[in-house]
Interface confidence: medium
């Protein structure tokens, strides 16, 4: 159900009864001549468009009967000046879309008593206006003058939307708001114009920090970027690695994809220890054995886990017969005392 709301306004401006006669040419107060003093009130009937306007009910869009507004000829001010019970313009509220056409009947009637405003007595009729019109919604008044020879009625009319209603038929509703259900003002056609920082049909969706990842970030108010579980960073575009992940990366949260040369659940096991740390000394050959371990193959003359220790070939005292020993890189040399010779001075010259 689409609710719409507007009001047809009819402004009675001036009525002229030149001779003070009724429609049947009788004098309003009886007798044959003036002053007739027609105490004039009006019946207004607003109805759907009819090619031939019938003054008979029903007044499908509304009806109104005014109090006595003047005698014979008179002008009518705007507002409620004449009578507290009468407001000019006369308002006909609409709870449905304005169709753009209408029929209007305005009858000027006479009464002897201000309390007797019966409209059924044809003897009281001064004049009757019937018209049908096309009318678009707008603030501008349409002016009209109805002349019947003895009477003139000047009036104007318009159809305006109620506050917060827009569009050709006043069927577009828009009321500015700034709360949980919307942050917007209204455009000329009733379109919702989101306040800065808001978007969506009802302007309830905050616009997050520019650059905020639309999958992994969100916001409750404009300019924020809150990360969903497993994501981090100013724009929530960095995944959070598996806790304890050391030399790994992630494409999705809680991954630990090891960098080259690393292994294990936390990528903390060095698979290329030889290259990264060069632990073997003195020209030894390094071999990775996995899980962050290695072995060094020492060159002759060196020992130790990292070949960091030079082998002392004189340690076992190889030289005989009191010869002195000199340690060389991969061997030793014996300096023989007089009378001895040989590799370890084991031979006697004697």
């Amino acid at each position: 159900q689409v609710w719409s709301s507007g009001v047809f306004e009819l402004k009675l401006q001036e009525f002229v009864n030149k001779k003070g006669l009724l429609g049947n040419r009788n004098c309003c107060r009886g007798g044959s001549g003036p002053p007739c003093a027609c105490r004039t009130f009006f019946r207004v009937c607003l109805k759907h468009y009819q090619a031939s306007v019938s003054p008979e009910p029903p007044c499908t869009y509304g009806s109104a009967v005014t109090p006595v507004l003047g005698v014979d000829s008179f002008s009518l001010p705007d507002g409620a000046g004449i009578d507290p019970a009468f407001s000019n313009p006369i308002r006909f509220p609409f709870g449905f879309t304005w169709p753009g056409t209408f029929s209007l009947i305005i009858e000027a009637l006479h009464t002897d008593s201000p309390d007797d405003l019966a409209t059924e007595n044809p003897e009281r009729l001064i004049s009757r206006l019937t018209t049908q019109r096309h009318l678009t919604v707008g603030e501008e008044w349409s002016q009209d003058l109805h002349s019947s020879g003895r009477t003139d009625l000047r009036y104007s009319y318009r159809f305006v939307c109620d506050e917060h209603y827009y569009g050709e038929g006043c069927s577009v509703f828009c009321r500015p708001r700034d709360d949980a259900f919307g942050h917007f003002t209204c455009g000329d056609r009733g379109e919702k114009m989101c306040d800065p920082g808001w978007k969506g049909q009802y302007c309830t969706d905050p616009i997050c920090l520019p650059g905020c990842d639309d999958q992994h970030g969100y916001c409750d108010k404009p300019g924020e970027c809150k990360c969903r579980v497993g994501w981090q960073g100013r724009y929530c575009d960095e995944c959070i690695r598996y806790p304890g992940c050391l030399h790994g990366t992630c494409q999705q949260p809680w991954q630990c994809n090891c960098q080259e040369g690393w292994g294990g659940l936390f990528c903390n096991q060095d698979l290329n220890y030889c290259t990264h740390h060069k632990p073997c000394r003195n020209g030894a050959t390094c071999t990775n054995t996995g899980q962050g371990s290695y072995t060094c193959s020492c060159r002759p003359g060196y020992t130790g886990a990292n070949c960091e220790l030079e082998v002392d070939e004189c340690a076992p005292s190889p030289c005989k017969n009191g010869a002195s020993c000199t340690d060389l890189e991969d061997s030793f040399s014996c300096t023989c005392p007089p009378g001895f010779y040989g590799k370890v001075c084991e031979l006697s010259a004697m």
């Epitope: 709360d179 259900f181 009802y202 108010k221």
Partner: antibody
Framework: EVQLVESGGGLVQPGGSLRLSCAAS????????IHWVRQAPGKGLEWVGG????????DYANSVKGRFTISADTSKNTAYLQMNSLRAEDTAVYYC????????????????WGQGTLVTVSS | DIQMTQSPSSLSASVGDRVTITCRAS??????VAWYQQKPGKAPKLLIY???FLYSGVPSRFSGSGSGTDFTLTISSLQPEDFATYYC?????????FGQGTKVEIK
Amino acid sequence: EVQLVESGGGLVQPGGSLRLSCAASGFTFTSYDIHWVRQAPGKGLEWVGGISPADGDTDYANSVKGRFTISADTSKNTAYLQMNSLRAEDTAVYYCARNDYDVRFVGSGMDYWGQGTLVTVSS
Amino acid sequence: DIQMTQSPSSLSASVGDRVTITCRASQDVSTAVAWYQQKPGKAPKLLIYSASFLYSGVPSRFSGSGSGTDFTLTISSLQPEDFATYYCQQSFTAPPTFGQGTKVEIK
């Protein structure tokens, strides 16, 4: 005088349905939001959902989304809460309340409330 | 959803006492906070809207203050008819949420 009158409460079995009405009078129905708020026995207030009768825009709490539907008939100045697939935890007094929204005041509050209608979901 | 946490959950006071109830929002809600009073078996009544504006017809002993995340309802001089449960409510972000309530009892 502004008045909101709820009706339609009662005892219903789990899985059943019930329709609550909220008849409004004394104000222009289409100029306000109408909200439904419930209160389980001995508990606090919980917002159920709301409607803007002028354009039919609705919003719901996650706990009732897909089960409850709010509507309004502007010719009768009445809002409705259609409750389907009812559960024991839906047992509560259901209030309808009027909310004026005014861009000058963030958080205008619910200024008129109905007397409430009790909904009991039990087998 | 935004959580509204009221403290204390209950308090005992005497007629004439100054009573303060606080409400903390889990995130910034500007001044979009209303306070309600509820008596047993009755519907809530609006006391304060937009954090600090006294609703029409509410006695001036009630006042509200705060913005952002911290809000306060103060009753300057407690009267016998003020013994009730008080709720705060935010309407800054959907869905609107209420505090759990503060019961003010006679000491």
